[in-house]
């Protein structure tokens, strides 16, 4: 059942963007979806520097000084455990086979907090977004992206890393979140479900969308990802929900049409450069923002999450291709690669628009008016 849309805006432009997010049945995450905090890890359970993962595998950036042994972005593998109660719990295990890079698998032991203590942190991602409780913050101005329209050459690396499909982005893609918050895009990847089962990481009033795109950025204040991990604002992720629409999305088709070539875990191909901004919604002015974490071990906090209010439309066939083409570790289909939503623990989600006004049909509970924390432009 689909409930009225979050905001009755007509979509801007057209292209890849759909209308604003529809809400679904109340399906709030259950208590056991949160990472367990008992059983703190022993010394041997902590990942070494070379094992540090991030929000999927982060592509390499040239550090200002090429130090021997410094963490490269390629050394950051990750995986999310499915977040619905019927799915395996929020656990993963490390796998050191083949190229000796760490991999994370769905299900199994040990629990994430034992692998990386930060996964039991208080300010984790993803979260459930409740527009009625979001703080309208007029200081949150429209996002600005620079250099996201890429020419066909040089080609970009598209890789099945065993837990997502990831496109490594070249230098020169800049994103501005506001005063003192300039970022460079590193990579983008997707999260999805399975046939008839949605797989977005964030949810809206408990509604999970079919899929979600993440564009991961590094603050220009840092030369390397390992320097930025855990630092407030060191990393920023743009997130958008993908949902089913009547037409094929030509921007996404440039990637989805190549998935068969990388069906096997660890395989990769080269794809022509494309308009990365066309993979995102067209309305850069309406979004939610909060501080959270990487959605996979090491679950480093301080990540600025910006979740678009407007969704992106893909055809049913495209969503099926996304969820039914790739294979993960152990001859298992790469599906349901999302983490359970995490408790806010007092965090306030800010909105760049008055999201609480007529944004949800549920008026049973009183609306809490949260105040905007951001400073003006």
């Amino acid at each position: 059942q689909r409930l009225p849309r979050m905001q009755e805006d007509s979509p801007l432009g057209g292209g890849s963007s759909g209308e604003d997010d529809p809400l679904g049945e109340e399906d709030l995450p259950s208590e056991e979806d949160s990472p367990r905090e008992e059983d703190p890890p022993g010394e041997e359970d902590l990942p070494g520097e070379e094992d540090l993962p991030g929000e999927e595998d982060l592509p390499e950036v040239k550090p200002k000084s090429e130090e021997e042994g410094s963490l490269k972005l390629e050394d950051l593998p990750t995986v999310e455990a499915p977040g619905d109660p019927q799915e395996p719990q929020n656990n993963a295990h490390r796998d050191k086979e083949g190229d000796d890079q760490s991999h994370w698998r769905y299900g199994g032991d040990p629990p994430w907090p034992r692998v990386s203590p930060a996964c039991a942190g208080r300010f984790q991602s993803p979260v459930d977004i409740r527009p009625q409780l979001a703080a309208f913050c007029p200081a949150l101005r429209p996002l600005e992206l620079l250099g996201f329209q890429l020419p066909p050459l040089p080609e970009l690396r598209l890789r099945n890393n065993g837990h997502s499909v990831q496109l490594t982005l070249p230098p020169g893609l800049e994103m501005a979140l506001g005063p003192g918050r300039e970022y460079r895009a590193l990579q983008l990847h997707l999260h999805w479900g399975a046939a008839g089962r949605p797989g977005s990481e964030h949810t809206v009033e408990g509604h999970r969308f079919p899929a979600e795109i993440h564009v991961v950025h590094l603050s220009t204040a840092f030369a390397r990802v390992d320097e930025a991990l855990g630092r407030p604002g060191g990393l920023a992720v743009l997130a958008a929900f993908l949902e089913e629409g009547p037409e094929e999305n030509s921007a996404y088709e440039q990637l989805l049409s190549r998935l068969e070539e990388i069906a096997e875990e660890g395989s990769e191909t080269q794809v022509p450069g494309l308009d990365i901004s066309a993979l995102l919604p067209s309305d850069f002015s309406r979004y939610f923002q909060y501080e959270g974490s990487l959605t996979t071990p090491p679950c480093a906090q301080g990540v600025i999450w910006t979740v678009f209010n407007q969704t992106v439309m893909l055809s049913a066939k495209q969503l099926h291709t996304l969820s039914d083409t790739l294979w993960g570790p152990g001859d298992s289909r790469l599906q349901l690669n999302f983490r359970a939503t995490q408790p806010l623990n007092g965090r306030v989600i800010e909105a760049s628009f008055p999201a609480g006004v007529d944004s949800s049909p549920r008026a049973a509970e009183p609306v809490q008016l949260n105040s905007c924390l951001a400073a003006g432009d």
Epitope: L12, L145, E174, G180, L280
Partner: antibody
């Protein structure tokens, strides 16, 4: 009050050099992207060069690459444009422009300094 | 490079008229478009950013709209002091490019 004051323009022979300066006041200079934009007499606007807040990212118009250098001194609140191997087609009014805080769009412009390249 | 094709190149209208200036980008620039006003002998002045956001202090008769490749600046009720050149600019991709300008004259 935001103020941008350009200086350093003048008449120079082809092949010559000039260094333009833009003195900024009324805002925290080190937080802002800055650009040089030029306008040939009776013509439209053209972005010449841009630099991010810490000077780590620079951009140049293709026709000035290798000849012009944009730089900034955040301690002195000053933006520079070093112009070498000047050509007649570089003749224009050169504006210093500030970008919105933390963003790429420009919000304040100086009054400009005129560069004339002629033999 | 992204071309910004601005039209008309000039127009003449009466005080109180509604004036529309259009700008077409040669490729998708999302909403990364700004509009500037340049009065004779002066530096450009900011009007609109992110396609439709008016800067503080800009009269509300000025409005911007559009997304993707087609953008519009509208002056809902032309005033005598609006005599100027108007430029659109995209800042989605380097090189940031400006439209050719529209000269607005008062009849």
């Amino acid at each position: 009050e935001v103020q941008l004051v350009e200086s350093g323009g003048g008449l120079v022979k082809p092949g010559g050099s000039l260094r333009l300066s833009c003195a900024a006041s009324g805002f925290t200079f080190s937080n802002y992207y800055m650009s040089w934009v030029r306008q040939a007499p009776g013509k439209g606007l053209e972005l010449v060069a841009a630099i991010n807040s810490d000077g780590g990212i620079t951009y140049y118009l293709d026709t000035v690459k290798g000849r012009f250098t944009i730089s900034r001194d955040n301690a002195k609140n000053t933006l520079y444009l070093q112009m070498n191997s000047l050509r007649a087609e570089d003749t224009a009014l050169y504006y210093c422009a500030r970008h919105r805080s933390g963003y790429f769009s420009m919000d304040y412009w100086g009054q400009g300094t005129l560069v004339t390249v002629s033999s | 490079d992204i071309q910004m094709t601005q039209s008309p190149s000039s127009l003449s209208a009466s005080v109180g008229d509604r004036v529309t200036i259009t700008c077409k980008a040669s490729q998708n620039v999302v909403s990364a478009v700004a509009w500037y006003q340049q009065k004779p002998g002066q530096a450009p002045r900011r009007l609109i950013y992110s396609a439709s956001n008016r800067y503080t202090g800009v009269p509300d008769r000025f409005s911007g709209s559009g997304s993707g490749t087609d953008f519009t600046l509208t002056i809902s009720s032309l005033q005598a002091e609006d005599l100027a050149d108007y430029y659109c600019q995209q800042y989605s991709n380097y090189p940031w490019t400006f439209g050719g300008g529209t000269k607005v004259e008062i009849k």
